[in-house]
Every structure is written in C-alpha cells, then in structure tokens.
Amino acid sequence: VLPRWRQQWSGSGTTSRFPETVLARCVKYTEVHPEMRHVDCQSVWDAFKGAFISKYPCNITEEDYQPLVKLGTQTVPCNKTLLWSRIKDLAHQFTQVQRDMFTLEDMLLGYLADDLTWCGEFNTFEINYQSCPDWRKDCSNNPVSVFWKTVSRRFAETACGVVHVMLNGSRSKIFDKNSTFGSVEVHNLQPEKVQALEAWVIHGGREDSRDLCQDPTIKELESIISKRNIRFFCKNIYRPDKFLQCVKNPEDSSCLSG
C-alpha cells in the first residue's frame, strides 16, 4: 500500500531551487558546447521532471528515465572515456585540463544532476524539499540512485577503444564491487567495442611508493575484465598533484622522464 501522506525519509530533501538549477545548468551547458546548441532545455527539464514527479520515490525504475536518456544522447570519441570511483574531484580536475577526455559529469545529463538530490511524492505534482529516500536506510530504487545507475550504464555501454578509470588508492577497497563503477559500469563495457580498460590508481600519501596495482581488489578487477575479453592495464599515479601539473604542462622538464 502506497502512503498518501507526506513521507518522512531518512535522507536530505530535494536541493533548493532544483528546477531552476537544472534549467540554468542546461542552458550553460549548451552555451559552452556548440554541438549542443540546438537543445531545448525546457524539453530536457520536462523529461527529467516526468521521471520522478507524482511517483512513489522508492519505486523508481530505469524505465522512468528512458525519455530523458533518449533526449540526452551524446557520444564520446573512442579512447576518451574516463570512469572514476571514489575520486570524483581529481577526475574532474583532470578532464578540465585534458579537455578531450570526458567523465559522465562532463556530459549533459551528468552535468545537470551532479551533486544534486531530488524526489517527488506519490500522486502529487510537488517536489519534496523536506526529505528524500536514503539508499541504505530507506530504499535503493530512489530517484537519484536510479538516475545514476541508468546514465552510468548508458555511459559505459557507449564507450569504445581504451577506457580509463581513476581509482582511489587511499581506500581500503581500491576497487569496490559495490560502487557504481564496480556494479554497473564494469559490467556494461562492450567487449566488441572496448579493447582495454586502463586503471589509474591514485596514491594518497606523498611517501607511498607501494605498487597498488598488485592490490587484491585490483587483481579482482583484472579478473572480471579479462573474463569479459577486455584487456586490462594498471598504472600507479604516485603524485596526483604532479600528475595534474604534467597534464597542464607536458613540456615541463620534470615531466619528460618516463
């Protein structure tokens, strides 16, 4: 039985001014990306809204987001997809410098929803600004989680060539099977289109010289990928600050050695 009263969920409510934020982000995105100059952001918002408004927020399906996903079709050139897990900020800093590589949040739909929370209420046209379902405490089929699962699946499915993934070497599980990368993206890379997955393991400590590519969880990732007939490579990024600096200035003498 679906409740008729306003549900009190365990998670924080919809981000303040959510419709205005999505619309403004969409307009900004189309202004910065000339290839998207034709996009009617009102239509994008209508499709976004249609995915969760008036629906019970613990019963959202990937199907609900299909109209939006259909509208937001974008392709990334082969060899230019960057996935990430538990290290979003560095991944985004990297694509801001290396402008020809793209994370999901560099694409229209990911850009629209990044860091936002939203949910509606069953049988009303209202957005719930008080509370939204928490993935652990309430339900996993909530509007935000299902959105990211849907767009992450699509992003992985369309990747081709050599796909890169940035992983956080400071975590106890460098590769986590329960992360979006581990549970969705890894399993939706298409072996007929993806030749290889290259993992970049980002080290946290300055003096950390271990080969984290030998970590048991990385070996687990290698096993999963190899079984899917995709080659696997792994690189240690010992100094993320230096790494970014060298992406910015590849001619710097300290960047030229191996």
Partner: antibody
C-alpha cells in the same frame, strides 16, 4: 549588413563535379557555423551540409555524404561546397546560410542553380 | 532522410487565423529547438521563428510559434495577402546529426 553571395552553379553531366562558393560579408565569418541548403524544382528545402567555427567539424545529409565536401576559408570569408559524382537528383538551387548560436539560419544568400543533366 | 511532417496546404480569408502543424520525433522536435521559415518563390528563405517561439526583430507579432512534445505549430493571425508563401519548419535531428526540414505548407489567402 550581412551579405551572402553564392557562385559556381551551372550545368553539369551526371558523374561530373562542381564547386560552389559563398562570399560572406557584414559579420565576423570565423565566429559562425555555416551551411548549405538546397531546393530541388517543385520540392521543399533540404539541408545539405554544415561546418562549425573554430577547428572545423563537418556534418552532412545522408543523401550527399561521401560525395560532397563542405569547407571554409576564414581568411577569405568564404564557404565552399565541392560536389562530386553528381546525380540528376542533385539538381536544385543551392543556398548558403549563416547559422546563429541556437541553430537557426538567420541569413541566406539568393542561391545558385545547379543542373545535372546529360 | 525522414523529414518533419507538415500539411501540404492551408488557407484562410484576409484577417483570419491560420495554424500550420509540424510533427517530428523525440530525436528532433522532442529534444531540440524548432525553427520556422517563410519562402516566397524566387527569393531567399526568411527566418520567422527561432527557439520554438521567438521572433527575430522585424517579424510581425501576427506570427507565433509553439511546441509541445514531438510537435510544433506556427500560427498566423490577421492573415494578409503578403503572407501567401511556403512555410517550413525545421529542427536538428540528434540521430542523423543534421537538420531536418518539414515538407512545406503552401499558405493561400482567399
């Protein structure tokens, strides 16, 4: 004011080639996307090709892809359409058009007639 | 290349209101802006409406555009003899990576 003047049209045999030019003035040519649109006799408008500003990206209608090449020379304020392997169905008035930021064709030339016939 | 669907003709007496429909799909009108052009024989086409419902300066407010879902329409109110022309809708199509035009609607003032 904005002016777009097409030239290079004429009569050509099937399988032949032709190069259309469009001379642009009255705006910063290098800033804008440019397109070719055609109208066959008694038919409607049909988009043919577009070229972006900056490092040019090109887009083509399925009906001309592989046969036509759109290009631009920003130094000369000129847009071109190289048409190879011409067919009778390519007979049309070809218009050069300037694209505004949100995709609309704000300015059009008067058109140049291309006739493909043996 | 599948275009947008328009009625071949529309007519009305002077002063009347005429509406032209334009139907497409989720990959063109559904996601992207709709544009309307007026074309008089022997002249260059003229932009009437951009971004679904915006009029360029110089276009009379008798012309108005709207969009809903995968369809759009152009309304001409207070029809005048100089409005006799062919009218085309257009939109970018994401699946084709190109523009699609409607087949055109000939407007006649009776």
């Amino acid at each position: 004011q904005v002016q777009l003047v097409e030239s290079g049209g004429g009569l050509v045999k099937p399988g032949g080639s032709l190069r259309l030019s469009c001379a642009a003035s009255g705006f910063t040519f290098s800033d804008d996307y440019m397109s070719w649109i055609r109208q066959a006799p008694g038919k409607g408008l049909e988009w043919v090709a577009s070229v972006s500003n900056g490092r040019p990206t090109t887009y083509y209608a399925d009906s001309v892809r592989g046969r036509f090449t759109i290009s631009r020379d920003n130094a000369k304020n000129s847009l071109y359409l190289q048409m190879n392997s011409l067919r009778a169905e390519d007979t049309a008035v070809y218009y050069c058009a300037r694209e505004a930021w949100s995709g609309e064709f704000t300015d059009w030339g008067q058109g140049t007639l291309v006739t493909v016939s043996s | 290349q599948a275009g947008l669907t328009q009625p071949p003709s529309a007519s009305g007496t002077s002063g009347q209101r005429v509406t032209i429909s334009c139907s497409g799909s989720s990959s063109n009108i559904g996601i992207n802006f709709v544009y309307w052009y007026q074309h008089l024989p022997g002249t260059a086409p003229k932009l009437l409406i951009y971004k679904n419902n915006q009029r360029p300066s110089g276009v009379p407010d008798r012309f108005s555009g709207s969009k809903s879902g995968n369809s759009a329409s152009l309304a001409i109110s207070g029809l005048r003899s100089e409005d006799e022309a062919d009218y085309y809708c257009a939109a970018w199509d994401d699946s084709l990576s190109g523009y699609v035009f409607g087949s055109g609607t000939k407007v006649t003032v009776l």
